[in-house]
């Protein structure tokens, strides 16, 4: 009597990454009968939602439904109709919403409530929208890259999937940079994790992992820039801010109310004798770098060693995948090659920041000016964060791999989040059936 279409032998999952600056929808696909195998889930689509992050809809929540429409409709096109009702949808909001919640729990709840109602209107298996913790964001990013690199597989391969893949089972560390926060996650070498908040224990595929993670709220590239501006305007003699992190000839008017809108600038807030100020770029990498370092408090550390702001950081260990804005910024600056040393990166940043704004605009005519203007700051910030913040050195720089995608899937927390929520990463090593992995035969 039932004529419900037989499901394909594949399954799908949807994760929306509601970041501080924008929302992206990811569609994943995997063979139904190999759910517990490592490395079988892959991304089939990414849809970037037009507009800002969801936290910006706080005064216009009625627009959230329309905002999400195009990408949700794209999901309906990509995923076969017969699979829609069985396809889980998860939305995870990150630091932009963490900041909104700090300002007002009620407003954050209202935004999430409208997001939930909008997403539940689609014919998918909507599983909820929530603000994930910084610890989760770090952990899921670490799971994603190691899953995609095949680090959880007990089978050793005689070939390499990706150029930077070492043939051992040593996991990669994860470095994630967003607009409002940044995460560092890795397995330290025989080192006690001195602060319980930064310690994670996983048992994955029959192996135990003791993982260090920390998320630095307000140290994503956008919030770090707001912090720097708020810090620097304190000592400006008038409403002109001569800023070394912007190209010579660049000018932009900033509202003081916008500057102090974010909780990230509260520590620098003061009454200013003007409502607006003008940034005037002077394009000096060294001075920009120095200004950024003032955002990192390294004078206090209650542990054997710290990153900054009194946060414990064990000695760096092994290779690291640096993704999200670490990758996008360095890719734009053409600095993602494994062959580019830290000294060369610094040299190129000096040249880039010193280029006149008019010249930059001509060279990159297709790039939105808002983004284009901030690459000097962002590139300098990445160097400062990695070198002085996380204590990478010229030598250990070669262990940082700037990664956009691995095997066609974006590096980021979303895949790890879905793998966890769909119970696709078993604690124990599944019993493999003969010839189930054609690659290994």
């Amino acid at each position: 009597t039932q004529n419900k279409a037989l499901p394909e032998n594949v399954k799908y999952g949807i994760v929306l990454d509601a970041g501080s600056s924008h929302t992206s929808l990811y569609i994943y696909k995997w063979p139904a009968e190999k759910e517990n195998d490592t490395g079988v889930v892959h991304q089939v689509e990414e849809c970037r939602v037009k507009g800002p992050g969801i936290s910006k809809f706080v005064q216009k929540v009625n627009e959230i439904g329309i905002y999400l429409t195009d990408c949700m409709e794209r999901a309906r096109e990509v995923i076969p109709r017969s699979q829609h009702q069985e396809t889980p949808v998860y939305l995870g909001a990150t630091a932009g919403m963490r900041l909104l919640r700090m300002e007002s729990e009620e407003l954050a709840d209202r935004v999430l409530d409208v997001v939930e109602r909008s997403l539940s209107n689609y014919p998918f298996d909507f599983q909820g929208a929530r603000i994930i913790t910084g610890q989760e964001e770090g952990a899921y990013g670490w799971i994603t890259i190691n899953y995609l690199l095949g680090k959880f597989s007990q089978k050793t391969r005689w070939f390499s999937i990706v150029p930077y893949e070492t043939n051992n089972q040593e996991t990669f560390g994860a470095l994630d940079l967003g607009g409002a926060s940044t995460q560092v996650t890795f397995v330290p070498q025989n080192q006690t994790i001195e602060s319980p908040d930064n310690a994670l224990q996983f048992r994955l595929y029959g192996k135990d992992y003791n993982v260090y993670t920390h998320s630095f709220l307000c140290y994503g590239k956008d919030q770090a820039l707001w912090q720097k501006l708020a810090k620097d305007i304190q000592v400006a003699s008038n409403e002109i801010l001569r800023d070394p992190c912007f190209h010579p000839g660049y000018k932009k008017v900033v509202n003081v109310s916008d500057l102090y809108k974010t909780p990230c600038t509260k520590r620098f807030e003061m009454t200013l004798p003007f409502q607006q100020f003008e940034i005037q770029g002077i394009g000096n990498y060294q001075q920009c770098h120095q200004s950024i370092l003032e955002l990192f408090n390294t004078s206090y550390c209650p542990y054997s060693q710290c990153a900054f702001n009194g946060i414990f950081l064990p000695p760096l260990q092994g290779d690291f995948g640096a993704f999200s804005a670490f990758y996008f910024v360095m890719k734009f600056l053409n600095l993602t090659s494994e062959k580019v040393s830290q000294e060369k990166v610094t040299e190129m940043m000096k040249k880039f920041c010193a280029q006149p704004w008019e010249e930059i605009k001509t060279s990159y005519a297709g790039v939105k000016e808002k983004y284009l203007s901030e690459y000097c700051f962002s590139g300098t910030y990445i160097l400062s964060l990695l070198l002085q913040g996380y204590h990478f050195t010229a030598d250990s720089w070669e262990h940082i791999h700037f990664i956009g995608k691995i095997q066609g899937s974006d590096a980021g927390w979303t895949l790890g989040y879905m793998l966890n929520l769909t119970n696709m990463i078993p604690a124990e090593q599944p019993l493999s059936t003969p010839l189930s992995h054609s690659t290994y035969v």
């Epitope: 009597t1 039932q2 004529n3 279409a5 109709r81 017969s82 829609h84 009702q85 209107n121 014919p123």
Partner: antibody, heavy 121, light 107 residues
């Protein structure tokens, strides 16, 4: 045989309440989204409410005209779906059909015979 | 909400005629359009799903076409038992909405 059977209709005064029931047979009830659709000479066919599955946390959706007044619910152990109607208005008068979709979603390949609700003083 | 508009409201036919019933959506709904037949004193019955997909048990003289916002239900040789009201339905997004119907009657 796949079958839906509604009950609970009748005459009710404006502002009153009424609960409609629908019992399903011939298919695995707990696996399918259930709906109520009504029909009146004035408004024609009108979708009223939908309830999804346990795995969807029994998510519900309503037509704007009944939101806040009507509640759809289900009892998978009894193969029943219900429509609790409060603060009834004359414009709620009509034949109420229990419907489902055994094949995919958002169309109705199984309909009950309907139960008539009259809201009048 | 997506508004479904059907035309004509009434269609008088002779057995053996080929007829076309029209349905227009107020916005694009891809192929998420379904057709129903309702005979006097009966519940509606699904005729066509997803604009053109046939339903088992429905005579092959019924066919559907269209995509986006314009759709057509065709009956290639009308039989006397086809008398009734034909409704189209938006199955694209909530709220699900129906057209007002086309009444098919014999001349």
């Amino acid at each position: 045989e796949v079958k839906l059977e509604e009950s609970g209709g009748g005459l009710v005064q404006p502002g009153g309440s009424m609960k409609l029931s629908c019992v399903a047979s011939g298919f695995t009830f707990s696996k399918y989204w259930m709906n109520w659709v009504r029909q009146s000479p004035e408004k024609g066919l009108e979708w009223v409410a939908e309830i999804r599955l346990k795995s969807n946390k029994y998510g519900t959706h309503y037509a704007e005209s009944v939101k806040g007044r009507f509640t759809i619910s289900r009892d998978d152990s009894k193969n029943n779906v219900y429509l609790q109607m409060n603060n009834l208005r004359p414009e709620d008068t009509g034949i109420y059909y229990c419907t489902t979709q055994l094949d995919l979603y958002w169309f109705f390949d199984v309909w009950g015979a309907g139960t008539t609700v009259t809201v009048s003083s | 909400d997506i508004v479904m508009t059907q035309s004509p409201a009434i269609l008088s036919v002779t057995p053996g005629d080929r007829v076309s019933l029209s349905c227009r959506a107020s916005q694009s709904i891809s192929d998420y359009l379904h057709w129903y037949q309702q005979k006097s004193h009966e519940s509606p019955r699904l005729l066509i799903k997803y604009a053109s997909q046939s339903i088992s048990g429905i005579p092959s003289r019924f066919s559907g076409s269209g995509s986006g916002s314009n759709f057509t239900l065709s009956i290639n040789s009308v039989e006397p038992e086809d008398v009734g009201v034909y409704f189209c339905q938006n199955g694209h997004s909530l709220p699900l909405t129906f057209g007002a119907g086309t009444k098919l009657e014999l001349r």
